[in-house]
């Protein structure tokens, strides 16, 4: 069979080889397409409800005024010339539709190095067959599941037209110290060959390099956090970051209802003050960062102070 590729909505003429150029003709066309079950026979004398999709022209050719998805299939003509010689024509028709230019929507203006970021979503509407979307970085293809690249794809089909909408969401993890203005683009490759790819306009997000966070240090006096009853404990939260973050305090994993301060003083320690303390530094740009936890415990005279304390009560300290 001869392969024919036709664009959806365009007319198509299939020649019936060996047919006399004008009536009377002894010929018939047989169709096996999405509009038929098994074979539908069309003849020159026909003329009827099928004319809107396929009709035999006076010269014996089959005319399809506007090819549709349902017209994909096999078309055969059997013709007899004036001398009684029989000729057969056989066509395999495939249809296609080129979508509009793909677009990148919901694109990010800024990416953070070292963490996964959504770059954007590439959308192509109105293709047939579906085709594929692919992403490019600085003109080179991006391979999903390699080097921090992941792609989420979705294909939808229009219930009436049968055309496809493709969506592809790109996630990347930019390398630290990499290109500060990478260029991303997306391209649609048609499902049928011999049609070139369609590419989106490029996007160039900035890559933001977060300053590596230095650890939040919690210093306790007396060292080890063991103190005699009535003694004083001073907890100091040291954060090298500038500007200084807000410091909040936690006891046994629960925030203490105190205003922010880098120093927490526990005077006249009693059993209710025993427990595990930590501080939380909140940076405007990073979010919260918690220190290690220290245990505060009471030692009776004559005991050696433990380095890890015991369960505490609910007393509140004072802030320096």
């Amino acid at each position: 069979a001869q392969n024919i590729t036709a664009r959806i909505g365009e007319p198509l003429v299939l020649k019936c080889k060996g047919a006399p150029k004008k009536p009377p003709q002894r010929l018939e066309w047989k169709l096996n397409t999405g509009r038929t079950e098994a074979w539908k026979v069309l003849s020159p004398q026909g003329g009827g409800p099928w004319d809107s999709v396929a009709r035999v022209l006076p010269n014996g050719s089959l005319f399809l005024p506007a090819v549709g998805i349902q017209d994909e299939g096999i078309f055969r003509c059997q013709a007899m010339n004036r001398n009684g010689k029989e000729t057969k024509s056989n066509y395999r028709v495939r249809v296609y539709q080129i979508p509009g230019k793909p677009e990148i929507v919901d694109s990010a203006s800024e990416l953070t190095a070292g963490v996964p970021n959504k770059v954007g979503t590439c959308v192509s509407e109105g293709s047939y067959p579906a085709g594929t979307l692919s992403w490019h970085l600085d003109g080179k293809p991006l391979v999903p599941n390699e080097k921090g690249v992941s792609v989420k794809e979705q294909t939808r089909r229009h219930p009436e037209t049968g055309l496809f909408t493709l969506q592809s969401e790109l996630m990347v993890t930019p390398a630290r110290g990499g290109d500060p203005r990478p260029t991303f683009s997306c391209s649609f490759s048609p499902g049928l060959p011999r049609h070139r790819a369609l590419r989106t306009a490029p996007i160039q997000p900035r890559v933001w390099e977060p300053v590596p966070l230095e650890e939040v240090q919690l210093v306790v006096e007396p060292e080890g956090g063991a103190v005699a009853p009535g003694g004083t404990v001073t907890l100091t939260c040291e954060v090298p970051a500038q500007p200084s973050p807000q410091i909040h305090w936690m006891k046994d994993g629960v925030p203490l209802p105190l205003p922010p301060s880098p120093v927490l003083i526990l005077p006249e320690i009693g059993p209710q003050d025993q427990g595990t303390y930590s501080c939380v530094a909140t940076h405007s740009s990073h979010g919260p960062q918690e220190s290690r936890a220290v245990s505060i415990s009471i030692i009776e005279p004559g005991e050696e102070g433990p380095t890890a304390g015991s369960v505490g009560g609910s007393g509140l300290g004072t802030l320096a």
Epitope: P49, W50, D51
Partner: antibody, heavy 119, light 107 residues
Framework: EVQLVESGGGLVQPGGSLRLSCAAS????????MTWVRQAPGKGLEWVAS????????YYPDSVKDRFTISRDNAKNSLYLQMNSLRAEDTAVYYC????????????WGQGTLVTVSS | DIQMTQSPSSLSASVGDRVTITCRAS??????VNWFQQKPGKAPRRLIY???NLADGVPSRFSGSRSGTDFTLTISSLQPEDFATYYC?????????FGGGTKVEIK
């Protein structure tokens, strides 16, 4: 809303002529074939004529061929049926319907207009 | 020409009954059959298109099926508003041919 409204029916003598009209709205008229169907009093439905989108091709059953002519004016979203040499057996309610080809069948109908052929 | 033989020509049924109407085509018409409902003094209304597809706004108690050249309209549970005349139509070839109609009456 898709709508078809017929007009032009009435009483006519045998051998006379009548022209029916159908005004279409609510859809892209020139995308569809159009069809006339009739129904004699107390009887079933009978196909009368069809016309393709462009108006280039028309189709009739033998019972009305050479007497009736279907036409359309896409600029006016209008369908027509010119009926000549009318007979008593043409008495019926005439309906205008959208479609008539394999893509649609007949999907939307007008309310009908009564044609009475009698002396 | 294709003949569409519709049966029965009339039937009596009660609300809640399952009703089946059949059209037999005299030759292959593929899937190109519509079903219509018509009430007295009104225009036909399409119920089923291409043999098995429910038209927009039509209650799901109506369904169409096909076996070769036999086409069936089924009303799964007859409602008071379903008492009417039903017609099939083949639109695979000219002349377009309607079945003779089935009048569904209250028992």
């Amino acid at each position: 809303e898709v709508q078809l409204v017929e007009s032009g029916g009435g009483l006519v003598q045998p051998g006379g002529s009548l022209r029916l009209s159908c005004a279409a709205s609510g859809f892209t008229f020139n995308n569809y074939w159009m069809t006339w169907v009739r129904q004699a009093p107390g009887k079933g439905l009978e196909w009368v004529a069809s016309i393709d989108n462009s108006g280039d091709n028309t189709y009739y059953p033998d019972s009305v061929k050479d007497r009736f002519t279907i036409s359309r004016d896409n600029a006016k979203n209008s369908l027509y049926l010119q009926m000549n040499s009318l007979r008593a057996e043409d008495t019926a309610v005439y309906y205008c319907a959208r479609g008539g080809d394999i893509r649609v069948g007949l999907d939307v109908w007008g309310q009908g207009t009564l044609v009475t052929v009698s002396s | 020409d294709i003949q569409m033989t519709q049966s029965p020509s009339s039937l009596s049924a009660s609300v809640g009954d399952r009703v089946t109407i059949t059209c037999r085509a005299s030759q292959d018409v593929g899937i190109y059959v519509n079903w219509f409902q018509q009430k007295p003094g009104k225009a036909p209304r399409r119920l089923i298109y291409r043999a098995t597809n429910l038209a927009d706004g039509v209650p799901s108690r109506f369904s169409g099926s096909r076996s070769g050249t036999d086409f069936t309209l089924t009303i799964s549970s007859l409602q008071p508003e379903d008492f009417a005349t039903y017609y099939c139509l083949e639109f695979d070839e000219h002349p377009l041919t309607f079945g003779g109609g089935t009048k569904v009456e209250i028992k």
